[in-house]
Amino acid sequence: QRLPRMQEDSPLGGGSSGEDDPLGEEDLPSEEDSPREEDPPGEEDLPGEEDLPGEEDLPEVKPKSEEEGSLKLEDLPTVEAPGDPQEPQNNAHRDKEGDDQSHWRYGGDPPWPRVSPACAGRFQSPVDIRPQLAAFCPALRPLELLGFQLPPLPELRLRNNGHSVQLTLPPGLEMALGPGREYRALQLHLHWGAAGRPGSEHTVEGHRFPAEIHVVHLSTAFARVDEALGRPGGLAVLAAFLEEGPEENSAYEQLLSRLEEIAEEGSETQVPGLDISALLPSDFSRYFQYEGSLTTPPCAQGVIWTVFNQTVMLSAKQLHTLSDTLWGPGDSRLQLNFRATQPLNGRVIEASFPAGVDSSPRAAEPVQLNSCLAAGD
């Protein structure tokens, strides 16, 4: 079962005073240990941790000559990270991607813009969400998901790609952000922290959540991911925050219970199909939306981000399993796989609900500081 926290009246993270300054959302300071590409976390002296590898996502497809018109996803290039303080005696580590691929990691060299110039773009993700500054947009209708309840067979590939745990999704999962804005789900992956430190990518009023799920989609206007990269609306990501709750989340347990099998970077296993929508909050009507980028190299822009207002609850043990089971390159722990929040640079985050309304009885009139841009334009 799903155990999301209902947020009936107040937006995520509660209210805010919110000055009338959209640029004030730039780089809102969040967690002190929030890693940046240029600024590794390096808290205390956990050996290897300042080199923690990361992330997601980059859906990259094989050339059509190999698999005509397919949506076959490949993992991102691996990240380079030094070994643990005690160097292993042998390192038969496989770099399945080969030496010709770009290497990146969270913190330290190489700077991401050197890996991919788009990472220095003006409209990057993740961002800090300040509900008081969000523009209420009634045109943003409830999300529509079709075909997300998968049967046990065929099984799905669950992989530790060195920067996240990624579940490859089969064809047939359809998602609509609104009329004429249709997408197909490709894969999902997670971002997390470490040892009691939160690791969501997006933040709300500077608050970082324990973890975050991303479901990556390709617009039906494109046959292949590489065609969609950098095109406005070519990719869409559904994002939800994961929080600690009192009970085990049975939907997530279907994946978390298999992580020990893929503890090592590059390892994968097959898991029975499951209800993918059960990994998301139940309220598809309340969300924030903005245009940003992939949160890892190549950091391609034009990605439509939809961040649910409602959170999903996992037990403390499940969050521990997520953050402490996997290992990445150089045999460092796979943790803190999140990018620092990026400046909005004038972008306005839209909300499908009046997120800026103060829920206290004193609020006579909603204070909306930004106006809605026509959805789907």
């Epitope: 808290e43 205390e44 002296d45 956990l46 050996p47 290897g48 941790e49 070994g83 643990d84 303080p85 005690q86 292993p88 005696q89 042998n90 390192n91 038969a92 580590h93 496989r94 470490a194 040892a195 009691g196 992580l259 020990e260 099998e261 893929i262 503890a263 090592e264 390892s267 521990h320 399993t321 402490d324 089971t325 290992w327 045999d331 460092s332 722990r333």
Partner: antibody, heavy 117, light 107 residues
Framework: EVQLVEFGGGLVKPGGSLRLSCAAS????????MNWVRQAPGEGLEWVSS????????YYADSVKGRFTISRDNAKNSLYLQMNSLRAEDTAVYYC??????????WGQGTLVTVSS | DIQMTQSPSSLSASVGDRVTITCRAS??????LAWYQQKPGKVPKLLIY???TLQSGVPSRFSGSGSGTDFTLTISSLQPEDVAVYYC?????????FGQGTKVEIK
């Protein structure tokens, strides 16, 4: 039920060699990091060596580096410790232990290695 | 390498007493600390991992706390069956390191 059974211990002279084995059952052996931990008579626990699931990374305590070699055969669900150039101070009960997100969660019963002339 | 210093090396307490054992790391290890109980002639048994998470089946009188460099194992009400040697283990990254052990006896 997770089970780890060590064998191969015994009496050996200083400078001699011994090969310990650990037979694993009740879990997917090939997915887990495995370790050897030892305990000299009347002393505390000392971690000896660790190996990742596909043998990509191997670690040793300084006290055994260059003399001991850890290995595994996932097809046989077995962990090994080849001990060369044995010394009197290597006398101990040697435990095989599984490593997970919960640290060393399962241990075998141990096998005694005695190095004496 | 990170050193683990455990204290006291031994203690004697009465049944029902609250017992505290500490473990200090020479460098920060976040919460990558486990506690083990080893009864005479037996195999070490995992009590607590991630500094404070009780392993399944372990009595609730055992608890752990701490993060960074200083950690504590507490037995809220000592029982006769708790007579054992207790070890801490740091497991953030290799090499794993055990504390020297604390022998707990009943007065």
């Amino acid at each position: 039920e997770v089970q780890l059974v060590e064998f191969g211990g015994g009496l050996v002279k200083p400078g001699g060699s011994l090969r310990l084995s650990c037979a694993a059952s009740g879990f997917t052996f090939s997915s887990f990091r495995m370790n050897w931990v030892r305990q000299a008579p009347g002393e505390g626990l000392e971690w000896v060596s660790s190996i990742t699931s596909s043998s990509s990374y191997i670690y040793y305590a300084d006290s055994v580096k260059g003399r001991f070699t850890i290995s595994r055969d996932n097809a046989k669900n077995s962990l090994y410790l080849q001990m060369n150039s044995l010394r009197a101070e290597d006398t101990a009960v040697y435990y095989c232990a599984r490593f997970t997100a919960m640290a060393l969660d399962y241990w075998g019963q141990g096998t005694l290695v005695t190095v004496s002339s | 390498d990170i050193q683990m210093t455990q204290s006291p090396s031994s203690l004697s307490a009465s049944v029902g007493d609250r017992v505290t054992i500490t473990c200090r790391a020479s460098q920060g290890i976040f919460n990558y600390l486990a506690w083990y109980q080893q009864k005479p002639g037996k195999v070490p048994k995992l009590l607590i991992y991630a500094a404070s998470t009780l392993q399944s089946g372990v009595p609730s009188r055992f608890s752990g706390s701490g993060s960074g460099t200083d950690f504590t194992l507490t037995i809220s009400s000592l029982q006769p069956e708790d007579v054992a040697v207790y070890y801490c283990l740091k497991y953030n990254s290799a090499p794993w390191t055990f504390g020297q052990g604390t022998k707990v006896e009943i007065k």
